[in-house]
């Protein structure tokens, strides 16, 4: 059979093979960070010869190059320095604007490794027009110097650069231009996933159930797309598994798109999923009109069931019929719903496109996207109502004009991205989004990204200061109340003196607030069985306080999910009629779960919650420990079934001002809480004044430790007693 | 509601295997953390619990009939099935399937099968 | 032993209180549940826990536990209580469960 010569390294980086050395195997070369390849790829024809896409030569020396970023062509009123024809990687270039103008954007901008200028382009602008001075961005030309309303500005790129976003804009009546900032790029440059996942995520996470965000921060680049929690969104997932994609990358496609499913599950809106896997022919795997597309689990499943060798028979790339097989679902949901009702004008579309190349059969796809922008009315008042991704992954063959011309350009957004490689694509896909900078009460929301604060990940995370040094801890299940510990309270009832500790962006200690009432369980006596032998009991040991003024929603202060109400019943995607039956069937279904607290320093500790028959062996223990239970007869009476137990294999132990913290569990992207911490056997923060210093019980502890958590499916009557009219309670 | 329904021969004869299969409808047999028990009662006598199986896969059985008893769980059809080998004329019984609910120190079960009599006869 | 004990037969008067008991050494460790059984019917959960009745079962059952003893009362009983009572427990060990032998009440 025939094969391709072996005679293709590249200096100084590496290549992998698609399908080996057999004919239509595509070789990709890679360079280290700061360098790109030069030819990207070879394809090894069925004669047994490589052919370089574009080269006019048959066989050159595949070489690595160092990486430039784009010179400016023009800059308005100001200077740049230094004066370069382009930049090396590291390179700077400042700006300065002239009398009379102010500088916005970055005064100094530094060339990325990728080919990319770091920060945002640089205007000098005196605010003279309707529309402020749109700029222009490096490596950019731009006819058109007027900013009244209806007046246009055209970019081109110089030399061989290639242009993203809006080649014409147009100065809207809102003052704000249409279309999205044109960008030149170098053919090889690709973007960093910590670009793409906040640009993405920014265009989404409106989509998907939030309200305006407090402030349009430099993470948060845009209009966020407004879906009333009534309201409904398709989202079309097209998966490209032409030849060119090996099969360990459509893997890593489908994982991307189950991460993205998964995540969009998440949130409070109705939304349907259409998967379509496209080479020669598109394969449409789950379609919007198939009431299964609504249910998380059948969409993963259709996803898992996508198989790489569903195309082996037409091995192109037909991005036309893959986008037209999106229309035709479109058309058919149109004549179901009939085109002037209001259930068909609600429903926004979202459709991202994840290839490795550009399409090489069946017609220009732009074709079908104009089809679908028609049928969907999208106009200037129906902007909203369409988004296109357009994806592009591994630099060899993508086509940055296609990519572009399919994706949707809206001001202050970007719908086009070339990614190094698939697992890049894996990176943006698990944090693109970030609902955690919603501004409205939506419960359970942790920010989960690596690089997050500790306050981001868990802002319903309260500290509670008494009258008495010991600290304790709470969580807040709405803006205005805290749930904690009883114990934390029993020192008198003076609570003008106590402070509640909320997380707040705007500095890294807090924000404190007055209680303007305390609710402490009437059943908690914790002398209550002393002449039991029981020197200290927590039954009943929960209260909440009402805080004095109403905490404003943000990455740092956000309520958890009470489980057994309408709010975690949304987060959990249960059905309307579920219980609270349903919610602990759902939330503690295991025999062990894994569970987190906070710790004094911040950081999620695990632990395991022992449900069932392995709650009491996790329990029993307690009959050994003397001091606190000197005459103890019956271990029941200590440990009854108000608590969850937890301590036993690797678990940490709460310190103890650690007390009335929230023991919750992630489900679906969002956190609940199912318990807070009340007592145990073993105090690991004793003896230390350092909070970041826990010592583990040594193995041979008699004891061995144990913590006991009140179980909030336990206290549901007190809870809707005193939150009936807060949060909306499920019946039991 | 939570329902439970015993299906199976009624009658099986002496050394053979009894087979029988509780099927559960108005809730998942995989949700929450239930032990999903078998209990006989010959003609005239008390319960005798046979055993539990929880949907992680732990069993739990009767020591005295231990060695014949096997409980298996079928998650994909929400049933659980029970098999007792080598059965005699003393496993004459009205055979119950029921949940088991093991909460604090207790343990009880809260919704039983309406029971199927299996007589077994040489 | 990991035996539940049971007198087998009782008698209550109509409206009378009525306390059915239920020895073994497991009821130290763990508390019995409750069951009643009709004729031909299948048994119904009437009590559990330390004293906890199930929804939809009147408030005239309750139950209590004392050393290694466990009582189902019914506090004035009617003729529709007459049945069979069955307590349970995990035993001793905690890994297996048992039933006592049942107690018949009748309604006099």
């Known amino acids: 059979a025939t094969s391709c010569p072996q005679n293709v390294n590249i200096s100084g980086g590496t290549f992998t093979l698609s399908h080996g050395w057999a004919p239509g195997s595509l070789l990709i070369y890679s360079c280290p960070q700061g360098l790109y390849p030069s030819p990207a790829s070879r394809l090894c024809k069925s004669s047994g010869q490589w052919q370089t896409p574009r080269a006019t030569r048959s066989l050159t020396k595949a070489v690595c190059k160092p990486v430039r970023c784009p010179a400016p062509v023009s800059f308005e009123n100001g200077i740049y320095t230094p004066r370069l024809g382009s930049y090396p990687v590291g390179g700077n270039v400042s700006f300065e604007c002239e009398d009379g103008f102010i500088l916005r954007g970055s005064p100094v901008r530094q060339c990325r490794p990728n080919g990319m200028w770091d920060g945002e382009t640089a205007v000098c602008d005196n605010g003279a027009g309707h529309c402020p001075n749109p700029g222009i961005s490096l490596g950019a030309v731009r006819t058109g110097s007027r900013f009244g309303h209806g007046d246009k500005v055209r970019y081109r790129c110089s030399s061989n650069l290639v242009l993203t976003g809006s080649a014409e804009r147009e100065c809207q009546g809102n003052g704000v231009w249409s279309g999205t900032e044109p960008i030149c790029r170098q053919p090889y440059s690709y973007d960093f996933p910590e670009d793409v996942a906040p640009a993405l995520g920014t265009s989404f996470s409106h989509m998907l159930g939030a309200t305006n965000p407090t402030q349009r921060t430099k993470e948060s680049l845009g209009r966020k797309i407004q879906i009333q929690r009534s309201g409904h969104l398709n989202l079309y997932l097209l998966l490209d598994s032409s030849q060119s994609v090996s099969e360990n990358d459509f893997l890593i496609f489908k994982e991307s798109a189950s991460l993205m499913v998964d995540r969009i599950f998440s949130f409070e809106i109705n939304v349907s999923v259409a998967i379509i896997t496209f080479a020669s022919e598109p394969k449409v795997l789950m379609s919007v009109l198939n009431v299964n597309s609504r249910d998380i689990t059948e969409v993963i499943s259709s996803l898992e069931n996508a198989k790489y060798k569903d195309h082996e028979n037409g091995t192109g790339t037909n991005t036309y019929a893959a986008l037209n097989s999106v229309y035709l679902m479109m058309n058919n949901q149109m004549q179901l719903l009939g085109m002037k009702t209001m259930a068909w004008q609600e429903i926004r579309h979202a459709i991202i496109l994840l290839t490795d190349g550009k399409s090489n059969m069946g017609g220009s796809p732009k074709t079908a996207v104009d089809q679908i922008r028609e049928i969907l009315n999208i106009n200037q008042k129906r902007n909203d109502y369409l988004d296109i991704y357009a994806i592009g992954v591994g630099k060899l063959d993508v086509d940055w004009r296609e990519l572009n011309e399919l994706g949707s350009k809206k001001d202050g957004e970007r719908h086009a991205f070339i990614l190094q490689d698939t697992k890049a694509l894996h990176q943006v896909f698990e944090h693109m989004l970030d609902v955690s900078k919603l501004t409205d009460t939506i419960c359970g929301v942790g920010n989960m990204s690596a690089n997050a604060s500790d306050q981001e990940r868990t802002p319903w995370h309260v500290t509670i200061k008494p009258k008495s040094q010991e600290t304790c801890r709470g969580a807040l299940i709405s803006d205005q109340w805290v749930l904690t510990a009883a114990h934390c309270f029993r020192d008198g009832n003076d609570h003008s003196l106590w402070r509640v500790n909320v997380g707040d962006p705007k500095s890294q200690w807090g924000k404190e607030f007055l209680i303007e009432k305390a609710v402490i369980s009437p059943g908690f006596d914790v002398f209550a069985k002393k002449n039991q032998g029981i020197l200290e009991f927590y039954g009943d040991d929960i209260a909440l306080l009402k805080l004095a003024q109403k905490v404003k929603m943000s990455t740092h202060a956000r309520p958890i999910c009470l489980p057994c109400t309408m709010e975690a019943n949304l987060a959990l995607r249960r059905p309307q009629g579920s219980t609270c039956r349903d919610h602990e069937n759902e939330l503690l279904n295991k025999q062990s779960v894994p569970a987190h607290f906070v710790a004094l320093n911040g950081s999620k500790l695990n632990i395991n919650l022992k449900m069932g028959v392995e709650w009491t062996s996790c329990a029993e223990v307690v009959s050994q420990e003397k001091t606190m239970f000197p005459n103890l007869t019956d271990v029941r009476e200590v440990v009854t079934d108000q608590f969850l137990c937890s301590g036993t294999q690797e678990d940490e132990s709460p310190c103890k001002g650690e007390s009335g913290g929230a023991v919750f569990l992630e489900r679906r992207f969002r956190f609940f809480q199912v318990g807070l911490v009340s007592w145990g056997l073993y105090n690991p923060c004793l003896g230390s004044a350092d909070k970041n210093s826990r010592k583990r019980a040594p193995r041979s502890k008699v004891p061995p430790p144990r913590d006991f958590h009140i179980n909030l499916f336990r206290m549901q009557p007190w809870l809707r007693q005193h939150l009936g009219d807060v949060l909306n309670f499920l019946p039991l | 509601q939570l329902q439970l329904q015993e299906s199976g021969p009624g009658l099986v004869k002496t050394s053979e295997t009894l087979s029988l299969t509780c099927t559960v409808s108005g809730g998942s047999i995989t949700s929450g953390v239930y032990y999903w028990g078998w209990i006989r009662q010959p003609p005239g006598k008390g319960l005798e619990w046979i055993g539990s199986?929880?949907?992680?896969?732990?069993?739990y059985n009767n020591p005295s009939l231990k060695s014949r008893v096997t409980i298996f769980i079928d998650t994909s059809k929400n049933q659980f099935s029970l098999k007792l080998s080598s059965v005699t004329a003393a496993d004459t019984a009205v055979y119950y399937c029921?949940?088991?609910?093991?909460?604090?120190?207790?343990?009880?079960?809260?919704?039983w099968g309406q029971g199927t009599l299996v007589t077994v006869s040489s | 032993s990991s035996e539940l004990t049971q007198d087998p037969a009782v008698s209550v008067a109509l409206g009378q209180t009525v306390r059915i008991t239920c020895q073994g050494d497991?009821?130290?460790?763990?508390?019995a549940s409750w069951y009643q059984q009709k004729p031909g019917q299948a048994p119904v959960l009437v009590g559990y826990?330390?004293?906890n009745r199930p929804s939809g079962i009147p408030d005239r059952f309750s139950g209590s536990t004392s050393g290694n003893a466990a009582s189902l009362t019914i506090t004035g009983s009617q003729a529709e209580d007459e049945a069979d009572y069955y307590c349970n427990s995990r035993d001793s060990s905690g890994d297996h469960l048992i039933f006592g032998g049942g107690t018949k009440l009748t309604v006099l």
């Open positions: 826990g330390k004293n």
């Open positions: 497991s009821l130290r460790r763990f508390y």
């Open positions: 029921a949940e088991g609910v093991s909460s604090g120190w207790s343990y009880y079960f809260d919704y």
């Open positions: 199986i929880y949907h992680g896969g732990n069993t």
